[in-house]
C-alpha cells in the first residue's frame, strides 16, 4: 500500500507565438482544476478507460478573470497535492494522465459548465520511495509543470511497496531506529525521516535528517518561496528592514544535484548542470528516449527536433495521441456505404456489405441481379435494393444451393405416400382418396366430392402415367430454358461474386486472427 502524489507547479500558455491569452472562454471568468489518472504497467488503453491504479480530483482553483492587455500569466492553481492511494504493489511502470479542466462561471443555464482544456499522457517508470520526479509537458498550446512521486505507507517498504517491515521478537541486528524487514532477515530498512519541520508540500528527503526543496522554494525547511527581489542576493539571517526571508546556509550545501550533476549557486538559489540523459532542477528526471520504448501499440519513436521534445511517436493505423495511447474509432466516420456494417479490426478496417452491394466500402451496387447468382435454375428477383432468389422445385436456401426435400413437410393428405421427383413431388393416394395432394375423398359410387376429377384422371386410371410423363417433358423444357438463361447471366457477373466471397473470407480470417 502507498500513495502516489502529484504536485502541479504551473499551468499556462506555452512559449512561442499563438499562445492562448486566457483559459476562459468569452463568456466570462473561470477556474481550473486537475484530474490525475493512473494505469498500471504498459497499458495501451485509451485515456477514457478505467484508471485501474486510481484517480484523484483537485480542489477548484481561484477564479481567473483575464486582465485586458496584461501579459498572460501562469494561471492561479488549486492548493495542495493530488494524492492517489494504491492498495496493492506499486507497478513501477505506469501511465500518468493529467487533465486540466476549466469550470466556466458565467451565466450558465443549469449551473457551471466544465470542459477539458488540456490532457497530457505519459508512460513513466518510477520506484516507490524515490525522490520527487519533475516533468514539463506540452498539451497543444499549453504547458504544464509538475512533480510526482510514489511513497509506501508503513508497514510496506521497498521500491514496489511489497515488503512488510514489522518488529520481531529476535534481537535486532540492525542499527538504532531501524527494524528487521520481513521476509529477508538480513535486511534492515526504514523510510527516511526528513529533518524535523521540513515542509511536506515543498520539501523531500532521500537521507534521514535531510530537507531538499522543490523548485521555487528554499530555506532549511523549504518554507521560503524563492523571490526575484533584490534581498535574495543578501546572505545571513532574515532582513527585518526589507521584510525578506533569506536562507542562511548556501544553496549548494550538500550538493542538491542528483545523478552526478554539478551545482552552481545563483542569487538565492542554485543551478544544476546535468549529465547526458538527465534533466530537471536537480537532474532527478531521467530523460525518456526512444530506446525506452515510450510509444504504445508499436508506434515508431523518432527523436524530437527541438530540445524540449525528447521524442515524437508516429502511430500505427487506428491509434493516436502523443504516445499512440488512444484508439481511434474509425467506424465513427461511417466509411461503409449503402448501409454496410463497419468492423474496426485494429490493424485494418472492413465493411460487411448488405445484400446487393460489394466492394471494400460497399460502394458497388450489384444491380440487375448481377451479383446474386441463383444456382440450380433459380431466378433472381429484385426489390427494395435487396435481391432474393426464387428457387426451382427441389431447391432452397439464399442462393438455391441447398437441395430441398419436397416430402419433408408431409404434403400428401389422408395417409398418401410422398415420392420426391426431380420436378417436384408425386403423391400415391390411399384407397378412397385422390387429387394432387390426396385431398379429395372418392365416393363409393365412384364420383368424387367437388371439385370433380375430370374423366381419365380417376384413381387407378391407366392414362394417368402418360399424362404425368407429358407434364414432366414440358417441365424439363422450361427448366432447361431457365438454366441456359441463368448461366449466361452468371458468367457475365461471376467476378462480382468471387470478389464478395473473397472479401467475406478475408474478413472471417481477420476476425479470427
Amino acid at each position: 500500500a502507498g500513495v502516489f502524489e502529484l504536485q502541479i507547479h504551473s499551468f499556462g500558455p506555452g512559449p512561442g507565438p499563438g499562445a492562448p491569452r486566457s483559459p476562459c472562454s468569452a463568456r466570462g471568468p473561470c477556474r481550473l482544476f486537475f484530474r490525475v489518472c493512473l494505469k498500471p504497467g504498459l497499458s495501451e488503453e485509451a485515456a477514457e478507460s478505467p484508471c485501474a491504479l486510481g484517480a484523484a480530483l483537485s480542489a477548484r482553483g481561484p477564479v481567473y478573470t483575464e486582465q485586458p492587455e496584461a501579459p498572460a500569466p501562469d494561471l492561479p492553481l488549486p492548493n495542495g497535492l493530488l494524492q492517489v492511494p494504491f492498495r496493492d504493489a506499486w507497478p513501477g511502470t505506469f501511465s500518468l494522465i493529467i487533465e486540466t479542466w476549466r469550470e466556466e462561471l458565467g451565466d450558465q443555464i443549469g449551473g457551471p459548465a466544465w470542459s477539458l482544456l488540456a490532457r497530457v499522457t505519459r508512460r513513466r517508470r518510477l520506484a516507490a520511495g524515490g525522490p520527487w520526479a519533475r516533468d514539463i509537458q506540452r498539451a497543444g498550446a499549453w504547458e504544464l509543470r509538475f512533480s510526482y512521486r510514489a511513497r509506501c505507507e508503513l508497514p510496506a517498504v521497498g521500491t514496489a511497496c511489497t515488503r512488510l517491515c514489522r518488529p520481531r521478537s529476535a534481537p535486532s541486528r540492525c542499527g538504532p531506529g531501524l527494524r528487521p524487514c520481513a521476509p529477508l532477515e538480513d535486511e534492515c530498512e526504514a523510510p527516511p525521516v526528513c529533518r524535523a519541520g521540513c515542509s511536506l508540500e515543498h520539501g523531500f528527503c532521500e537521507q534521514p535528517g535531510e530537507c531538499r526543496c522543490l523548485e521555487g522554494w528554499t530555506g532549511p525547511l523549504c518554507m521560503v518561496p524563492v523571490s526575484t527581489s533584490s534581498c535574495l542576493g543578501l546572505r545571513g539571517p532574515s532582513s527585518t528592514t526589507t521584510g525578506c526571508l533569506v536562507p542562511g546556509p548556501g544553496p549548494c550545501d550538500g550538493n542538491p544535484c542528483a545523478n552526478g550533476g554539478s551545482c552552481s549557486e545563483t542569487p538565492g538559489s542554485f543551478e544544476c548542470t546535468c549529465p547526458r540523459g538527465f534533466y530537471g532542477l536537480r537532474c532527478e528526471v531521467s530523460g525518456v528516449t526512444c530506446a525506452d520504448g515510450p510509444c504504445f501499440n508499436g508506434g515508431l519513436c523518432v527523436g524530437g527536433a527541438d530540445p524540449d521534445s525528447a521524442y515524437i511517436c508516429h502511430c500505427p493505423p487506428g491509434f493516436q495521441g502523443s504516445n499512440c495511447e488512444k484508439r481511434v474509432d474509425r467506424c465513427s466516420l461511417q466509411p461503409c456505404r449503402n448501409g454496410g456494417l463497419c468492423l474496426d479490426l485494429g490493424h485494418a478496417l472492413r465493411c460487411r456489405c448488405r445484400a446487393g452491394f460489394a466492394g471494400p466500402r460497399c460502394e458497388h451496387d450489384l444491380d440487375d441481379c448481377a451479383g446474386r447468382a441463383c444456382a440450380n435454375g433459380g431466378t433472381c428477383v429484385e426489390g427494395g435494393g435487396a435481391h432474393r432468389c426464387s428457387c426451382a422445385l427441389g431447391f432452397g436456401g439464399r442462393n438455391c444451393r441447398e437441395r430441398a426435400d419436397p416430402c419433408a413437410a408431409r404434403p400428401c393428405a389422408h395417409g398418401g405416400r410422398c415420392y420426391a421427383h426431380f420436378s417436384g413431388l408425386v403423391c400415391a393416394c390411399a384407397p378412397g382418396y385422390m387429387g394432387a395432394r390426396c385431398e379429395f375423398p372418392v365416393h363409393p359410387d365412384g364420383v368424387s366430392a367437388l371439385p370433380a376429377a375430370p374423366p381419365g384422371l380417376r384413381p387407378g386410371d391407366p392414362q394417368r402415367a402418360g399424362v404425368i410423363a407429358v407434364i414432366v417433358v414440358v417441365v424439363i423444357a422450361i427448366v432447361a430454358g431457365i438454366v441456359v438463361l441463368v448461366i449466361s447471366r452468371k458468367k457475365r457477373m461471376a467476378k462480382y461474386e468471387k470478389a464478395e466471397i473473397k472479401e467475406m473470407g478475408e474478413m472471417h480470417r481477420e476476425l479470427n486472427a
Epitope: G299, L300, L345
Partner: antibody
C-alpha cells in the same frame, strides 16, 4: 547503442526444426513489439510474425505461409525473443532478421537458415 | 494481402545524379508507407516513414512523397554510399508487405 543479435541459424533437413534467438540491448525490451522478417536468397523482404507485450497477453500474429509451423515467444527478463520453426520446408531457406515495433525501426544483423536435403 | 509493386527493379546511375524510385500499392494505403535501404550482406535500415518523413539520422538528400496508391523515393544527389537496394513497405493493413526492391548500381 541499440543492438539486436540473432543466433541459432544453420543447415537443417526438410521436416526438421530450428530455434532462433534474438538478444536485445540498449533498449527497454519489454516495451517493444518484436517481429521476425526473412529474406530468401536474392529475393525481397517477407514479414514472418510478431509478438506484442505482456499487457497484450503476449499476443502473436503470423504470416499465412508459416502459420501452424512457426511459434514466436519472448523472455523479457532475458531481453530475448525466439522463433521456433517446425516442419521446415525448402522455401523457408532465408536470412532471418528480428526487428522492433510496427514499422520495423531497429533491425538485427540476421542469421541464415538453410533447409536442404 | 496488399501488393506493393516497385519499379524499376534495377537502375544504373552516377554520383551526383537525381534518382527516383516508385512504388505502387494494389489498394489505398493512405500515407502508411516506409522506405528501407539495404546494402549487400547487411540488414535493412529505415529511411522514410509515413511516406514523406525522414527517420532519425537520415541525410536530407533522401525524400519521400505520395499517398493513396502511388509513392516515390527520391535521392536528390546520389552519393557513393547510396548504392544499395531500396524497398518500400506498406503498413496500412496487416500484414505488412514489401515491394520487390530496386537495386541502384554504379553506372
Amino acid at each position: 547503442e541499440v543492438q539486436l543479435v540473432e543466433s541459432g541459424g544453420g543447415l537443417v533437413k526438410p521436416g526438421g526444426s530450428l530455434r532462433l534467438s534474438c538478444a536485445a540491448s540498449g533498449i527497454t525490451f519489454s516495451n517493444f513489439w518484436m517481429n521476425w522478417v526473412r529474406q530468401a536468397p536474392g529475393k525481397g523482404l517477407e514479414w514472418v510474425g510478431q509478438i506484442r507485450l505482456k499487457s497484450d497477453d503476449y499476443a502473436t500474429h503470423y504470416a499465412e505461409s508459416v502459420k501452424g509451423r512457426f511459434t514466436i515467444s519472448r523472455e523479457d527478463s532475458k531481453n530475448t525473443v525466439y522463433l521456433q520453426m517446425n516442419s521446415l520446408k525448402t522455401e523457408d531457406t532465408a536470412v532471418y532478421y528480428c526487428t522492433t515495433g510496427y514499422y520495423f525501426d531497429y533491425w538485427g544483423q540476421g542469421t541464415t537458415v538453410t533447409v536442404s536435403s | 494481402n496488399i501488393q506493393m509493386t516497385q519499379s524499376p527493379s534495377s537502375l544504373s546511375a552516377s554520383v551526383g545524379d537525381r534518382v527516383t524510385i516508385t512504388c505502387k500499392a494494389s489498394e489505398n494505403v493512405g500515407t502508411y508507407v516506409s522506405w528501407y535501404q539495404q546494402k549487400p550482406g547487411k540488414s535493412p535500415k529505415l529511411l522514410i516513414y509515413g511516406a514523406s518523413n525522414r527517420y532519425t539520422g537520415v541525410p536530407s538528400r533522401f525524400s519521400g512523397s505520395g499517398s493513396g496508391t502511388d509513392f516515390t523515393l527520391t535521392i536528390s544527389s546520389l552519393q557513393p554510399e547510396d548504392f544499395a537496394t531500396y524497398y518500400c513497405g506498406q503498413f496500412y493493413s496487416f500484414p505488412s508487405t514489401f515491394g520487390g526492391g530496386t537495386k541502384v548500381e554504379i553506372k
